[in-house]
């Protein structure tokens, strides 16, 4: 699985990585002005896990299972 993955939050992450086989999802989440793009585990694609892991109380997130599916426009849909 390929995901956009930036180590630190950035407004427009364009770094694509081949996620290791442990990861079966891509995540994009926005918390205030911070946007996170990550390789992720689908079992952790829920509000509680995302907020705990990002240490953010309020956010919107989108998980997906296709290559490079975690781009900004997904959060606007």
């Amino acid at each position: 699985l390929q995901c956009y993955n930036c180590p630190n939050p950035t407004a427009d992450c364009k770094t694509a990585v081949n996620c290791s086989s442990d990861f079966d999802a891509c995540l994009i989440t926005k918390a205030g002005l911070q946007v996170y793009n990550k390789c992720w585990k689908f079992e952790h694609c829920n509000f509680n896990d995302v907020t705990t892991r990002l240490r953010e109380n309020e956010l919107t997130y989108y998980c997906c299972k296709k290559d490079l599916c975690n781009f900004n426009e997904q959060l606007e849909n």
């Epitope: 180590p7 442990d22 990002l54 240490r55």
Partner: antibody, heavy 121, light 107 residues
Framework: EVQLLESGGGLVQPGGSLRLSCAAS????????MSWVRQAPGKGLEWVSY????????HYPDTVKGRFTISRDNSKNTLYLQMNSLRAEDTAVYYC??????????????WGQGTSVTVSS | DIQMTQSPSSLSASVGDRVTITCRAS??????LAWYQQKPGKAPKLLIY???TLAEGVPSRFSGSGSGTDFTLTISSLQPEDFATYYC?????????FGQGTKLEIK
């Protein structure tokens, strides 16, 4: 304050079994992945197992696969490592560690003090 | 499995020195690299993750750099409490592997 307290180590004969426990406090245990890492005397660090927050996924290196089993009881805030068919090369200090620092999988930010396991006849 | 190779295995330096430790991965791990410090008889302590991001409470004299396969940990001005063993670890995916360690000793 985050605390991880391992127990269950000791002396065991080759081929024997041991169950390590790690009691967690000071954080939402059920929301964090956990790992066990060991260190043989005078040697470096070796990761031995991982379990996701809900227990849905586990990972092991080939050196312990089929012999060690990681599990957790989120109602008791406790992590376990069941070690079977122990070998001399399993002799080490075993640390439990909290995993998932700032949304990064497999980064361990808090560690216990360790429990010592000796496998010898 | 991804192999992590550190160099040097040991290093002697003095307080105030600038020290660099290197870590090489056997394949591309992007920026999925962490550094830990361990003192004798103690548990490891997380210093850096994502190759260059300092963990909470870590002094700014520590810095990390690199991506892909080659990484460095730099201590800009050694303090007495920095003499310890340092390990790199990739966090790209399982199985996790550590470097063999670099023991930093007082000259």
């Amino acid at each position: 304050e985050v605390q991880l307290l391992e127990s269950g180590g000791g002396l065991v004969q080759p081929g024997g079994s041991l169950r390590l426990s790690c009691a967690a406090s000071g954080f939402a245990f059920s929301s964090y992945d956990m790992s066990w890492v060991r260190q043989a005397p005078g040697k470096g660090l070796e990761w031995v197992s991982y379990i996701s927050s809900g227990g849905g996924s586990t990972h092991y290196p080939d050196t312990v696969k089929g012999r060690f089993t990681i599990s957790r009881d989120n109602s008791k805030n406790t992590l376990y490592l069941q070690m079977n068919s122990l070998r001399a090369e399993d002799t080490a200090v075993y640390y439990c560690a909290r995993d998932g620092y700032y949304a990064e999988y497999y980064v361990m930010d808090y560690w216990g003090q360790g429990t010592s396991v000796t496998v010898s006849s | 499995d991804i192999q992590m190779t550190q160099s040097p295995s040991s290093l002697s330096a003095s307080v105030g020195d600038r020290v660099t430790i290197t870590c090489r991965a056997s394949e591309n791990i992007y920026s999925y690299l962490a550094w830990y410090q361990q003192k004798p008889g103690k548990a490891p302590k997380l210093l850096i993750y994502n190759a260059k991001t300092l963990a909470e409470g870590v002094p700014s004299r520590f810095s990390g750099s690199g991506s892909g396969t080659d990484f460095t940990l730099t201590i800009s001005s050694l303090q007495p409490e920095d003499f310890a063993t340092y390990y790199c670890q990739h966090h790209y995916g399982s199985p996790l592997t550590f470097g063999q360690g670099t023991k930093l000793e007082i000259k």
